[in-house]
Interface confidence: medium
């Protein structure tokens, strides 16, 4: 099949380069973080960020890999097993369960390539798909058919 | 900061252009869809994906841009403006709002790149952030101070 | 052998909704979008939207004004397209179509379904 | 929408003929352009993918070419059995859309 032509470099610039340099911005989720105070507890906050506000709480927790591009992946943990009642805000509702949304990501890993007579010449990119948690959401436990 | 060396060139291909073969492959969320007998309804099924049987229920909505890497990115969309009551599934409680999950996704745009004296030189790429919306959750409303 | 296996012929009156299934074999049903695409008698093909069975994932043709639901089945490899307030200008063939891919190049409708006839009168 | 306008709208022409189908977009559309043939009463099949590249199991005697807003789809032999309507269709926008049409006869 065909396919785009190759990439341009700019005045000498190895643009695989340039992709990597550009890549390895961490983009964390869109909203910043405000201070909670109970960040590690089991409960929906009526301040701060969604993650802290959502009656299924989830952290985020930072997977950081030199080798890999992105660098910085982030990871959904949800505080608690249930989701909190929304009439306190801390109690837990058993009709409800804590379950975490997955996606998978493509990432490209760095690998020593190697030259026609088996040198190492520089580093190559492999594709890969990387499972990360996205965030954490109540849902209904499902009923056994 | 420091960044990776060029990436290596297998053969002659220029590993940006491997980087955009690569990189073409959609990649849905991870949990295949099952029957969702009311696709666009407000109500929290008790089979199916996690989109469905979620109290803050969404869709996904197809965004294709061939200029674009990834070509194919999914929107959520949800389906109800407040949560949907754990207990019933399907009435909604006015003390949830159902809220959109955003990120900002590291996307590419191919476009014209120019030689030296302006004449077109294939495709470069560009990068840019991109907002997609993950997921609906459900969360307490902010309480204004 | 892929093979994308439709619904019988259907009869409706106007103001009625009608259901057509399209059953897949032959390949791994959720690697693939599902099209679905109209042919009015003596009319040009009329796409009318897809779905990413993985996710459940659709894209619609605006001009179907929401009266189109696609669906999927993926445990029977099944989709489903539903067309509601049917009026007369709606009576053709309704084809499933599976859209195949390569990297930046091409989306195709590289197997189609036998169609259905759906006659609003 | 992306209009999408074929022409002739019909044709006729004798086996052995070179024959030559144009389709024209309203807007810039890159290659991103696919034919396809419906034989009469019969399912439409894909017959050339991103302009140019023919489908599997496709005779060699078709072939595609253009960029932009003008397309070809060219028949450099006529055979009997390439009797049909034949479609043009982009893929650069949703909603896809197809051209009318062009209905090849023999003569």
């Known amino acids: 099949y065909s396919h785009w032509p190759s990439c341009c470099p700019s005045k000498g610039q190895d643009t695989s380069e340039e992709l990597l340099r550009w890549s390895t911005v961490p983009v964390p989720p869109l909203e910043p973080a405000r201070p909670n105070r109970h960040p590690e507890s089991c409960r929906a906050s009526e301040d701060g960020p969604l993650n802290s506000r959502a009656i299924s709480p989830w952290r985020y927790e930072l997977d950081r890999d030199l080798n890999r591009l992105p660098q910085d992946l982030y990871h959904a943990r949800c505080l608690c097993p249930h989701c909190v009642s929304l009439q306190t805000g801390s109690h837990m509702d058993p009709r409800g369960n804590s379950e975490l949304l997955y996606h998978n990501q493509t990432v490209f890993y760095r690998r020593p390539c190697h030259g026609e007579k088996g040198t190492h010449k520089g580093y190559c990119l492999e594709r890969r798909l990387y499972r990360v948690s996205l965030a954490c959401v109540c849902v209904r436990p499902r009923v056994m058919g | 900061y420091s960044h990776w060396p060029s990436c290596c060139p297998s053969k002659g291909q220029d590993t940006s252009e491997e980087l955009l073969r690569w990189s073409t492959v959609p990649v849905p969320p991870l949990e295949p869809a099952r029957p969702n007998r009311h696709p666009e309804s407000c109500r929290a099924s008790e089979d199916g994906p996690l989109n469905s049987r979620a109290i803050s229920p969404w869709r996904y909505e197809l965004d294709r841009d061939l200029n674009r890497l990834p070509q194919d990115l999914y929107h959520a969309r949800c389906l109800c403006p407040h949560c949907v009551s754990l207990q019933t599934g399907s009435h909604m409680d006015p003390r949830g709002n159902s809220e959109l999950l955003y990120h900002n996704q590291t996307v590419f745009y191919r476009r014209p790149c120019h030689g030296e004296k302006g004449t077109h030189k294939g495709y470069c790429l560009e990068r840019r952030l991109y907002r997609v919306s993950l997921a609906c959750v459900c969360v307490r409303p902010r309480v204004m101070g | 052998e892929v093979q994308l296996v439709e619904s019988g012929a259907e009869v409706k009156k106007p103001g009625a909704s009608v259901k057509v299934s399209c059953k897949a074999s032959g390949y791994s049903f959720s690697g693939y979008t599902m099209n679905w695409v109209r042919q009015a008698p003596g009319q040009r093909l009329e796409w009318m939207g897809l779905i990413n069975p993985y996710n459940g994932g659709t894209s619609y043709n605006q001009n179907f004004k929401g009266r189109v639901t696609l669906t999927v089945d993926t445990s029977a490899s099944t989709a489903y397209l539903e067309l509601n307030s049917l009026r007369s200008e709606d009576t053709g063939v309704y084809y499933c179509?599976?859209?195949?891919?390569?990297?930046?190049?091409?989306?195709?409708?590289?197997?189609w379904g036998q169609g259905t006839l759906v006659t609003v009168s | 929408d992306i209009q999408m306008t074929q022409s002739p709208s019909s044709l006729s022409a004798s086996v052995g003929d070179r024959v030559t189908i144009t389709c024209s977009a309203s807007q810039g559309i890159s290659n991103y352009l696919n034919w396809y043939q419906q034989k009469p009463g019969k399912v439409p099949k894909l017959l050339i993918y991103y302009t140019s590249s023919l489908h599997s199991g496709v005779p060699s005697r078709f072939s595609g070419s253009g960029s932009g807003t003008d397309f070809t789809l060219t028949i450099s032999s006529l055979q009997p059995e390439d009797v049909a309507t034949y479609y043009c269709?982009?893929?650069?926008?949703?909603?896809?859309?197809f051209g009318q049409g062009t209905k090849l006869e023999i003569k």
């Open positions: 179509a599976r859209e195949d891919f390569d990297s930046w190049t091409y989306f195709a409708m590289d197997y």
């Open positions: 269709q982009q893929y650069l926008a949703f909603p896809y859309t």
